[in-house]
């Protein structure tokens, strides 16, 4: 057993059939020695008398809040949450596997430039009694520091029968150097609690590997004389590190009609304008990804090109 | 120890494209002993991530970007005499900082060269013969070390006496690479810079 | 699959003009582009121009500007290469290339050779 | 129009050696580079491209590099059918060009 925080206790459990469970020791946090009773939850059952009290802890109904009174007064709360670990492996029923970039990748993160500062999100299909707590640090080991947000519903999307809700946090490397070498990577520690259950994910990483610059920006068009070729030319995000010659993108240009099936036309450069065919209903779209270290590329901007 | 923006020297255009060539060869090396190695930790999640010239040169400082000059994370316990408030400096001054620039990033390169010719020795024994380095690579290292036409002593090829640990070997390997191509980046974009200065 | 079969050796005469078609099949025949490459014997390859057969959009190389005509006809899925004014450097065998991108070539024709003499 | 230089004109490489095929355009292209093998008699076959994206169908044994000017095509380990002649092509701008090709020839 061990404190998540003031008054919340997590018990790890090992989760199999007829488990012994685990043996908790519950103090009241009070000066008082006799004529204390404890309860769980809301159920006014007496289930022991003493300024201790002794459970075994074998399943969810054990897990929950106790409650230490005296002559009808409150002393103290202490909650318990349970920590599942099945064959070895704790339980991840809270979040959902994203599968991206592989297996078993619950959080997944960005950023949209080496400032230090990274966006992480997760997946689940709980919709209410759900907290998130997020930690996050440079290494491990002599942990340099990271502050996150708070945790907030991002999005709801509604996926078959179910209804799929993100949540995201925000996180800023105290002090980033956007032209560091990275040799720690990032940790990020999410706890989540689902009513009585207690679940945390990892997710270490390098800022350099987690780029996704935003797509390019005033993206404008100009018919070249005499010719089916467009001139497209584009500027840098606002987000994107600067100086953009340090920091350099290369950029994917691309004429497509509505469906991914058509016939396209598509070429690379280093530069911010290029020169295409445009055909009629399509439109032609940019991406841009860093120029010397290949991580993901961006979204597309794109423009009609009528 | 930063880089103010400044006329480039006319020879800068060829550094570029051997930094370019460079970061190539190195990402191709890489690419190769991953695949080749794949049932080793050769990935980036798997290696220890050291810096073989740590505290021996200091590129990232020496070539920092004047625009970055501002940012107290980058000059964190680094030697800023040169910055005098952020104006611009004298270009006596300024070719100075750029020749400590070229010349950490030289350091830089035979650092790795004696590593890599080193750790080539110790593979081309290996009876498995299952990778060897890029002569390739170690070509283009060789060129952006002319192209950056500093002198300074030979740094010995290191021997050993006793047998090599190949299993080891082929691990520093791809911890070297791993740190040789993130150096590689940052040489790229530092000639980017002085290329578009 | 997607298959291109071409037309048959032709020896013309210097100053004639020639025709060259290119049957696609396996795929719809707008939803690639059509290209035309020569190669002179034991030369190099040459790009000489694409067409859009959705539309008819043409592209052509300069050096080919005025001197060749490419055209589809969409209901027998045959594009048609037509070169004026034959020289015996013309002298070449005649591709046709098709892709759904437009500036690479991923389906060949088997080619055809064209003779200039007189 | 862009000029793209092959080398060399000729390779004389024994089967299982590993070939290296160099490409050199006249400005920066980017990764816009595709190569072909071209056998006697037969039209050309698209084995890379842009730069290094495989092709199904096309054995592992051929792979891609480079950016800006200069590529190169890797063939691993060669085999009886690789000796043919290599052409790359750039897609930077039109015109379309193609090197002037690498015979690889049995040594």
């Known amino acids: 057993i061990w404190e998540l925080k003031k008054d919340v206790y997590v018990v790890e459990l090992d989760w199999y059939p007829d488990a012994p469970g685990e043996m908790v020791v519950l103090t009241c946090d009070t000066p008082e020695e006799d004529g204390i009773t404890w309860t769980l939850d809301q159920s006014s059952e007496v289930l022991g008398s003493g300024k201790t009290l002794t459970i075994q802890v074998k399943e969810f109904g054990d897990a929950g809040q106790y409650t230490c009174h005296k002559g009808g007064e409150v002393l103290s709360h202490s909650l318990l949450l349970l920590h599942k670990k099945e064959d070895g492996i704790w339980s991840t029923d809270i979040l959902k596997d994203q599968k991206e970039p592989k297996n078993k990748t619950f959080l997944r993160c960005e950023a949209k430039n080496y400032s230090g500062r990274f966006t992480c999100w997760w997946l689940t299909t709980i919709s209410t009694d759900l907290t998130f707590s997020v930690k996050s640090s440079r290494g491990s080991s002599d942990p340099q520091g990271v502050t996150c947000g708070a945790a907030t519903l991002s999005a709801e999307r509604v996926r078959g029968d179910n209804k799929e809700y993100e949540y995201s946090v925000e996180c800023q490397e105290d002090s980033a150097c956007p032209a560091a070498e990275e040799s720690l990577p990032i940790e990020v520690m999410v706890d989540a609690v689902h009513k009585l259950k207690y679940e945390n994910y990892t997710s270490s990483f390098f800022i350099r590997d987690i780029i996704k610059p935003d797509p390019p920006k005033n993206l404008q068009l100009k018919p070249l004389k005499n010719s089916r070729q467009v001139e497209v030319s584009w500027e840098y995000p606002d987000t994107w590190s600067t100086p953009h010659s340090y920091f350099s993108l290369t950029f994917c240009v691309q004429v497509q009609g509505k469906s991914k099936r058509e016939k396209k036309d598509r070429v690379f450069t280093d530069k911010t304008s290029a020169t295409v065919i445009c055909r009629k209903n399509a439109s032609i779209s940019v991406r841009a990804q860093d120029r010397y270290y290949s991580s993901s590329w961006s979204e597309w901007a794109s423009v009609p090109c009528s | 120890r930063n880089l103010p923006v400044a006329t480039p020297d006319p020879g800068m255009f060829p550094c570029l494209h051997h930094s370019q060539n460079l970061l190539r060869a190195v990402s191709n090396m890489l690419q190769k002993a991953r695949q080749t190695l794949e049932f080793y930790p050769c990935t980036s999640e798997e290696i220890d991530h050291e810096d073989i010239t740590k505290d021996k040169t200091s590129t990232v400082e020496a070539c920092l970007p004047l625009e970055l000059t501002k940012n107290e994370s980058c000059l964190n316990s680094r030697e800023t005499s040169f910055i005098t408030n952020g104006s611009c400096l004298a270009s006596r001054k300024t070719s100075f900082m750029m020749a400590l620039c070229l010349s950490s990033i030289y350091e830089d390169l035979k650092m790795y060269q004696v590593e890599f010719k080193t750790m080539n020795a110790k593979l081309l024994m290996d009876p498995k013969r299952q990778i060897f380095l890029d002569q390739n690579m170690l070509a283009v290292i060789d060129e952006l070390m002319q192209a950056l036409n500093f002198n300074s002593e030979t740094v010995p090829q290191k021997s050993s006496l006793e047998e090599p640990d190949f299993y080891k070997t082929k691990i520093k390997l791809c911890i070297l690479l791993h740190a040789f191509r993130i150096r590689a980046v940052t040489i790229d974009r530092v000639m980017s810079y002085l290329n578009a200065s | 699959q997607v298959q291109l079969v071409q037309s048959g050796a032709e020896v013309e005469k210097p100053g004639a003009s020639v025709k060259v078609s290119c049957k696609a099949s396996?795929?719809?025949?707008?939803?690639?582009?059509l290209h035309w490459v020569r190669q002179a014997p034991g030369q190099g390859l040459e790009w000489m121009g694409w067409i859009d057969p959705e539309n008819g959009d043409t592209e052509y190389a300069p050096k080919f500007q005025g001197g060749v005509t490419m055209t589809t006809d969409t209901s027998t899925s045959t594009a048609y290469m037509e070169l004026r004014s034959l020289r015996s450097d013309d002298t070449a065998v005649y591709y046709c290339?098709?892709?759904?991108?437009?500036?690479?070539?991923?389906?060949w024709g088997q080619g055809t050779m064209v003779t200039v003499s007189s | 129009e862009i000029v793209m230089t092959q080398s060399p004109a000729t390779l004389s490489v024994s089967p299982g050696e590993r070939a290296t095929l160099s490409c050199r355009a006249s400005q920066s292209i980017s990764i816009n580079l595709h190569w072909y093998q071209q056998k006697p008699g037969q039209a050309p076959r698209l084995l890379i491209y842009f730069a290094s994206q495989s092709i199904s169908g096309i054995p592992a044994r051929f792979s891609g590099s480079g950016s800006g000017t200069e590529f190169t095509l890797t063939i691993s380990s060669l085999q009886s059918e690789d000796f043919a002649v290599y052409y790359c092509?750039?897609?930077?701008?039109?015109?379309?060009?193609f090197g002037g090709g690498t015979k690889v020839e049995i040594k």
């Open positions: 092509q750039q897609s930077n701008s039109f015109p379309l060009t």
């Open positions: 290339a098709a892709n759904k991108e437009l500036r690479y070539f991923d389906v």
């Open positions: 396996g795929y719809t025949f707008t939803d690639y582009y």
